[in-house]
Interface confidence: low
């Protein structure tokens, strides 16, 4: 339904508080380097303008699209060219090209300082002094570092952030109350950002059809009692929501997400028996809860899939009549029967089925040709099962840190051209699959592990896309969304790689390592490990283990010394010499 003024429509639907928060997120995700105060000023100007349009929808400029209004506002920033360089050229374009241009300049790895957490008392004072500014700053800092963060979900995080400070700043032990909550929000926030980044990559790099296929599979697993048509409706609506958010249309996205949650709750009897609790919550919690809801129980006595998709004489007729609908039904029927499969595996099976029908429906005897199609699924199912079994065994044997190290070595040997910080970040996250998924029973391991790995490998893909250095990474990232993980798994040691020159500076450490948290210390050691492999890609596990054990002993020894700095300088030289000898450098 058309509205005279889109900005007035969204302001009324969302309310002033959410409107302002979403505009701030949108601006911070576009202009990631702009100071907080500049963004607040822009948001206030847009909000005041929106209010004039609510009062009179026929007022001047109220009929303009949100892209036009927001783009015009962003293009008023005086330092655009100095701060953003060629991004300023976007302002010479007309909509919709201007918005597309802004989107292309979003930076997944912006050059921003790490967020340092102040002392608890300092944070509580800031919270009490000006709660509104404190919370806006949270939105701004997260949004500019995560330019694809799912905006309506960020509102939910901000609500929890506020609740944590409200509760803990009046607690007897503020730190004991607040810090675990902030840690949890940080970790959940990073995971949420990475999951959304995959959705946007799926839409932007592989198209709407790829996203819809993913959504059909996931929603069919989650809502196995829902009809195919009901799932199709949810998929269409969900695709619209994510297309909007990934496209920077955050007001429309938040509004449509609220409508979708409303629809789901009004129709929960035909969707899932697990939605009752979610639907009793307020809007932001409700939407989050629905997105995370557990799979409903499978209907009893579901008939064999073979009848409709292999044995029926109408397979090719039904396929020809409506290819995507028929494949969608196949995916729906397979997924609702297999909550134990990863979404990407289900998509591989559907792709295999599609390829078989394309070939067989043009054959002399189609049925004879596709009769054994389900046999082709067996190796596709067994590959991730075996891989997860082997890696969970390795994880249980090594523990998380050493398992991460094994992956660091494995991936550095596969793609040694990738930057060390990226290899460390990605391998650490890959290694977290162990503690995240290996504790699950068999039936939940694969969806947990392989779908999580898809999210992590997408991080590698988007970081690598910014500065491509490896054809192998480009190939695995761009050829097939659902085969990214098998593609990376299949990579062997890169024999074409010329080892990096040895640089003693890379392996020089100082006393500041002693004051780092355990996590930061691990990262330092893992950075050194990646550099070692880049210098000596053919080093054996045993050689690398020996050097890393020596390194750990060296850090422990010097951190206990009276004169730490002298210890690091003198013992460090010995360690470098010993390591060079051990690795034959």
């Amino acid at each position: 339904d058309a509205h005279k003024s889109e900005v007035a429509h969204r302001f009324k639907d969302l309310g002033e508080e959410n409107f302002k928060a979403l505009v701030l997120i949108a601006f911070a995700q576009y202009l990631q380097q702009c100071p907080f105060e500049d963004h607040v000023k822009l948001v206030n100007e847009v909000t005041e303008f929106a209010k004039t349009c609510v009062a009179d929808e026929s007022a001047e400029n109220c009929d303009k699209s949100l892209h036009t209004l927001f783009g015009d506002k962003l293009c008023t920033v005086a330092t655009l060219r100095e701060t953003y360089g060629e991004m300023a050229d976007c302002c010479a374009k007309q909509e919709p090209e201007r918005n597309e241009c802004f989107l292309q300049h979003k930076d997944d790895n912006p050059n921003l300082p790490r967020l340092v957490r102040p002392e608890v008392d300092v944070m509580c004072t800031a919270f009490h002094d000006n709660e509104e500014t404190f919370l806006k700053k949270y939105l701004y800092e997260i949004a500019r570092r995560h330019p694809y963060f799912y905006a309506p979900e960020l509102l939910f995080f901000a609500k929890r952030y506020k609740a944590a400070f409200t509760e803990c700043c009046q607690a007897a032990d503020k730190a004991a109350c607040l810090l675990p909550k902030l840690d949890e929000l940080r970790d959940e926030g990073k995971a949420s950002s990475a999951k959304q980044r995959l959705k946007c990559a799926s839409l932007q790099k592989f198209g709407e059809r790829a996203f819809k296929a993913w959504a059909v599979a996931r929603l069919s697993q989650r809502f196995p009692k829902a009809e195919f048509a009901e799932v199709s409706k949810l998929v269409t609506d969900l695709t619209k929501v994510h297309t909007e958010c990934c496209h920077g249309d955050l007001l429309e996205c938040a509004d449509d997400r609220a409508d979708l949650a409303k629809y789901i709750c009004e129709n929960q009897d035909s969707i899932s028996s697990k939605l009752k609790e979610c639907c009793e919550k307020p809007l932001l919690e409700k939407s989050h809860c629905i997105a995370e809801v557990e799979n409903d129980e499978m209907p009893a006595d579901l008939p064999s899939l073979a009848a409709d998709f292999v044995e029926s004489k109408d397979v090719c007729k039904n396929y020809a009549e409506a290819k995507d609908v028929f494949l969608g039904m196949f995916l729906y029927e397979y997924a609702r029967r297999h909550p134990d499969y990863s979404v990407v595996l289900l998509l591989r099976l559907a792709k295999t089925y599609e390829t078989t029908l394309e070939k067989c429906c043009a054959a002399a005897d189609p049925h004879e040709c596709y009769a054994k199609v389900f046999d082709e699924f067996k190796p596709l199912v067994e590959e991730p099962q075996n891989l997860i079994k082997q890696n969970c065994e390795l994880f249980e044997q090594l523990g998380e840190y050493k398992f991460q190290n094994a992956l660091l070595v494995r991936y550095t040997k596969k793609v040694p051209q990738v930057s060390t910080p990226t290899l460390v970040e990605v391998s650490r996250n890959l290694g977290k699959v162990g503690s995240k998924c290996c504790k699950h029973p068999e039936a939940k391991r694969m969806p947990c592990a392989e779908d999580y790995l898809s999210v992590v490998l997408n991080q590698l893909c988007v970081l690598h896309e910014k500065t491509p250095v490896s054809d192998r990474v480009t190939k695995c990232c761009t050829e097939s969304l659902v085969n990214r993980r098998p593609c990376f798994s299949a990579l062997e040691v890169d024999e074409t790689y010329v080892p990096k020159e040895f640089n003693a500076e890379t392996f020089t450490f100082h006393a500041d390592i002693c004051t780092l948290s355990e996590k930061e210390r691990q990262i330092k050691k893992q950075t050194a490990l990646v550099e070692l492999v880049k210098h000596k890609p053919k080093a054996t596990k045993e050689q690398l283990k020996a050097v890393m054990d020596d390194f750990a002993a060296f850090v422990e020894k010097c951190c206990k010394a009276d004169d730490k700095e002298t210890c690091f300088a003198e013992e460090g030289k010995k360690l470098v010499a010993a390591s060079q000898a051990a690795l034959g450098l």
Epitope: E227, S232, N267, S270, A322
Partner: nanobody, 124 residues
Framework: EVQLVESGGGLVQAGDSLRLSCTAS????????MGWFRRAPGKEREFVGG????????WYTDSVLGRFTISSDNAKNTVYLQMNSLKPEDTAVYYC?????????????????WGQGTQVTVSS
């Protein structure tokens, strides 16, 4: 084009039961909601109840809740309306309809295909 044929109507006493059937000429590939409507003499056609094609979910108008039950038999491409504790005010021509959309449809406009109807008369 999907053809819908109702059967099972007739004359019964108040308090009796009756089962109506609606058979589709073919399994409607994109049709997932089947509905029953009725038109009493001199009144508008009104929604009675609906069911998803697989039979997992069914919904009813308040006046028939607890008395009428809709079920389906996929193998026979048939949907049934079991009417118990019939009342004189249930007298009407009962129509079967099929919708190619989704949701708990209750309005005539939401349905794409219609049967010719079958007469049900409940005498007191």
């Amino acid at each position: 084009e999907v053809q819908l044929v109702e059967s099972g109507g007739g004359l019964v006493q108040a308090g009796d039961s009756l089962r109506l059937s609606c058979t589709a000429s073919e399994r409607p590939f994109s049709t997932y909601v089947m509905g029953w409507f009725r038109r009493a003499p001199g009144k508008e056609r009104e929604f009675v109840g609906g069911i998803t094609w697989s039979g997992i979910n069914a919904w009813y108008t308040d006046s028939v809740l607890g008395r009428f039950t809709i079920s389906s038999d996929n193998a026979k491409n048939t949907v049934y309306l079991q009417m118990n504790s019939l009342k004189p005010e249930d007298t009407a021509v009962y129509y079967c309809a099929a919708a190619s959309g989704v949701g708990r449809y209750r309005y005539e406009l939401q349905y794409d295909y219609w049967g010719q109807g079958t007469q049900v008369t409940v005498s007191s």
